[in-house]
């Protein structure tokens, strides 16, 4: 639902996007994800900050927590206990890494309308959550786990060995947070709250990255993070389970690691509770092409967890690494032993399989030259999943329902024809037993969130349709967007092109390539966005292109695993190939082509600029990786193996940006990095700069003091303003 193209007579009332629009977030959209608390009820924070409970079936709603109560402790978040007796209120949010933060927590008693006094929670807390039933609390404070049977009780201290930067209990260390779990927590309640499983990460032997944080003091302070770079010593992980009913009668019980995993360095990748007395753990060899899923049962007589070899399921890749970005997680069926899981089929496409006894006997549920992306929910009779099957566009997402109660199973696309032009990229959120669900459409038109009946799929109501955004865009000249593909040497290169509003194929336009290109990523997606590149097309008349080359996701293993052990080669080649094809289209000014990217994209843009092709006049690298020896072990080794002589050291050395310093001589290069980047360390850009200086190559650079990998806040405005000036200068566009 983009505003319709207008006739010339109306064009004088329309205006182009401005950089200010982008930096102010003028055209940002809203989504509505219900906070489900039952099959038919959800919570939502109203515009005036009341926490409101909605009952879909009665149509009634009432405020369970007033904005006054929220404001009394400056709460920015809340969590209702499953028995609905208490709410935790979260304040003093203090960000740590990508997912982690600390906060102060207050417990509010809904029955008497007062905050719980006595045995208050310590501060700041690293993670806190309710049990799935009742109102037990688990929390992590100073790297140790505590348990409260009731909010007003004293806590039980479950672990005692927690130590900053050494031992992490119930929360991940840096590398597990960023590259494996993608969460701020590493503890999991069993379905009825009888048991609490948690991970212990021992970082004692991990090398530490240290960088200065300048702050406002006379002396900068040093940030130290145990951070395993490629080939370095990794964290040692153990999984324990505690009986929360009687924490003093039985200590934390360690869950055994499968023998074939324990024989060398390994990772824990995820934990899924099946029942209160059955748990599923996933493990991964350090060389990440072998994953083991282990189903463990509680042995009541010994109060231990038993993981029989017969309940170990091995997933192995012979052409790349195990899984996509992560190894997929199982979704168990009601029999509590069989499960559904996404992994590669014999043709090399990721599909849903049903595993009843062994992986070898898995029944393939979906198939085709497309990929199943996510399993949302399995009920007694239906399985809901998303895929990019519809009309063969890999950058779309639709929601499907497969009936599993009947034979043969029938498949229905729930979303394909709902708002066909406006909505081609969906996610979903399901209530208990999938009684109802919310669909959130991200585009390509203006996003819309709707509520649906889980049985009939009927739309019940619109939750958020972004009317204000739609009205605000009515007088904006938005760029045109098209998603198409190039067929080159048996490779399909999907691209998105963003064209100026008055695009004329007979004219010549400057071209900006925006690249990410990391393994298992996807940039060409049918989603709505009004962002910096929208402005560059709308106001500055540039053509912007995004290309998904080899190594990108959701188009089969051949494309995905093409970059295995060879990062920095084919991703760059495919961007260059696409640029050549764009030039052939006739509307690109080949003397004004630029490339830019952030993070992995900064790496690819740097290598593209240094490719010696002469295609690019200029380019920007924001927070680039410059050598894979500088990046995190878990991520890097997944795709590159180890930086050892007998493994892949040669390509580690060949694929650095520094090795190509000489080739930057004939391009304009802008290198940007935050000095407090915990993820892609400033070291990466420091080494590029050193190599360029040593090669006597001129370049431009900008650092952002005390900024991390996101370059947020005022730095964002400065960054985009600076990059805009650089590109306009490169393209000889007047300011």
């Amino acid at each position: 639902l983009r505003p319709p193209r207008v006739h010339n007579s109306e064009e004088n009332t329309m205006r182009a996007l401005t950089l200010k629009d982008i930096l102010n977030g003028t055209f940002s959209y809203k989504t509505f994800f219900p906070n489900w608390i039952s099959g038919q009820e959800y919570l939502h924070q109203s515009a005036d900050n009341n926490i409101v409970l909605y009952n879909i079936e009665t149509g009634q709603s009432y405020t369970i927590l007033s904005n006054r109560t929220m404001k009394s402790v400056n709460a920015s978040n809340y969590g209702l206990s499953p028995d609905r007796q208490f709410v935790y209120l979260e304040s003093d949010y203090s960000k740590l890494w990508r997912y982690s933060y600390t906060a102060t927590y207050y417990i509010y008693d809904l029955s008497n309308g007062e905050f719980v006094r006595g045995n208050e929670l310590p501060r700041p807390i690293q993670y806190l959550c309710w049990s799935p039933v009742g109102s037990k609390l688990a929390y992590v404070y100073q790297n140790n786990i505590y348990l409260k049977q009731r909010p007003g009780d004293p806590p039980f201290q479950i672990t005692f060995n927690g130590r900053e930067n050494k031992i992490f209990n119930g929360i991940p260390d840096w590398v597990y947070e960023e590259e494996m779990l993608a969460t701020k927590y590493a503890l999991w309640w069993s379905p009825n709250g009888k048991f609490l499983a948690y991970a212990e990460f021992n970082d004692t032997d991990i090398p530490v990255i240290a960088y200065s944080y300048y702050g406002d003091e006379q002396y900068p302070r040093t940030i130290n993070i145990p951070y395993p770079k490629a080939g370095a010593k990794n964290p040692f992980v153990r999984i324990f389970i505690i009986d929360t009913t009687y924490p003093a009668y039985v200590g934390p019980q360690e869950v055994p690691v499968p023998a074939m995993i324990a024989s060398s360095d390994y990772y824990f990748s995820w934990l899924t509770w099946v029942t209160d007395e059955r748990v599923c753990l996933q493990w991964l060899k350090r060389v990440q092409n072998v994953s083991v899923l282990s189903i463990c049962d509680f042995r009541e007589d010994w109060q231990t967890w038993d993981c029989p070899k017969t309940q170990e399921h091995i997933e192995e890749s012979r052409t790349g690494w195990a899984g996509g970005f992560f190894v997929s997680t199982p979704v168990f069926s009601y029999d509590a032993i069989s499960y559904y899981k996404i992994f590669s089929d014999k043709d090399g496409y990721k599909h849903i399989h049903y595993i009843k006894d062994t992986v070898e006997n898995a029944i393939q549920i979906t198939s085709g030259k497309w990929e199943a992306i996510n399993i949302f929910r399995v009920t007694q009779d239906s399985l809901f999943y998303s895929s990019n099957e519809f009309e063969d566009y890999p950058g779309r997402r639709n929601i499907y329902r497969i009936s599993i109660g009947s034979y043969p199973p029938s498949k229905k696309c729930v979303t394909c024809h709902l708002r066909k032009e406006r909505c081609q990229y969906y996610t979903a959120s399901f209530s208990d037993y999938a009684k109802y669900y919310a669909l959130v459409c991200y585009g390509p038109g203006i996003p819309i969130s709707t509520l649906h009946d889980g049985r009939t799929d009927q739309e019940i109501k619109i939750l958020e349709e972004n009317k204000e955004l739609e009205n605000a865009l009515k007088n904006i000249q938005l760029p045109k967007e098209e998603i198409k593909k190039l067929e080159v040497d048996e490779i399909t290169l999907w691209y998105k092109m963003i064209l100026p509003p008055q695009f004329d194929r007979s004219k010549k336009y400057p071209l900006l390539i925006q690249v990410y290109g990391g393994p298992c990523s996807q940039s060409v997606r049918s989603v709505f966005a009004v962002n910096w590149i929208s402005y560059l097309a709308s106001k500055e008349g540039m053509v912007i292109a995004l290309v998904d080359g080899r190594g990108t996701a959701f188009q089969g293993d051949k494309l995905l695993y093409a970059v295995y052990r060879k990062l920095g080669v084919y991703e760059v080649e495919d961007q260059i190939t696409a640029v050549r094809k764009f030039i052939e289209m006739g509307f690109i000014d080949e003397k004004r082509i630029a490339i830019w990217g952030w993070s992995y994209g900064g790496y690819v843009s740097s290598l593209a600029l240094a490719s010696g092709t002469g295609l690019f006049k200029c380019g920007i690298a924001v927070a680039p990786v410059s050598s894979w020896e500088y990046y995190a072990s878990v991520y890097t080794e997944r795709f590159m193996g180890l930086p050892t002589k007998d493994d892949n050291l040669e390509h580690y050395k060949n694929s650095t940006v520094m090795a190509r310093a000489e080739y930057f001589r004939n391009v304009d290069y802008l290198l940007i990095h935050g000095t407090a980047d915990d993820n892609v360390h400033f070291q990466n850009s420091a080494q590029i700069a050193k190599a360029l200086v040593n090669a006597q190559v001129d370049f431009q650079a900008m650092w952002y003091s005390d900024q991390n990998h996101g370059l947020s806040g005022l730095s964002t405005n400065h960054l985009y303003t600076h990059m805009t000036h650089f590109l306009k200068q490169c393209f000889s566009l007047s300011d």
Partner: antibody, heavy 121, light 107 residues
Amino acid sequence: EVQLLESGGGLVQPGGSPRLSCEASGFTFSSYALSWVRQAPGKGLEWVSAISGSGGGRYYADSVKGRFTISRDNSKNTLFLQMNSLRAEDTAVYYCAKEGYSSSGTYWDHWGQGTLVTVSS
Amino acid sequence: AIQMTQSPSSVSASVGDRVTITCRASQGVSSWLAWYQQKPGRAPKLLIYVASTLQSGVPSRFSGSGSGTDFTLTINSLQPEDFATYYCQQANSFPPTFGQGTRLEMK
């Protein structure tokens, strides 16, 4: 009035296998976890084993794990401790104790009078 | 296992005196601590749980305080029936452990 009455103690040879019993009255038996706590002559107290109200959860001190088995018969309001492979260091007065505090704080608000188990050849 | 250390091991006092017994845990036990009284040839009797909560039927001259690792049992105005051995017990972690006991005897 809560009452707990232990029996089954006596002189046992090393390696012997006596079974202790504890008859309870005066409270809803199946609602409470029960424990065995022992006290060696002239020494302090040592928790031995516990069992949840339903009998599903059975818990042991490391010193007796694999040798002792706790059980209960809720229909007869009786708690048991099957002791196997007895050693001299198991010599003690064995108390049956009822858990008191309801929020999983492991305290014992009522105790039996104890039964002495002497392990000697 | 968490070790509980009581001090003193024994104390002599007179009727009417105020007596304080301390208990130290080798690791934090929050407030999960109980105090018991045991007389020769008898079973222990619960006096205090959750560090400071008086068990019903126990005289108010008994009081408990502390949290974390350091705890105190105080008997105000000692009575003849209070001469006994007192044990602290932690209920935070496996296994539940007792202090070695403090013998309170008549001066």
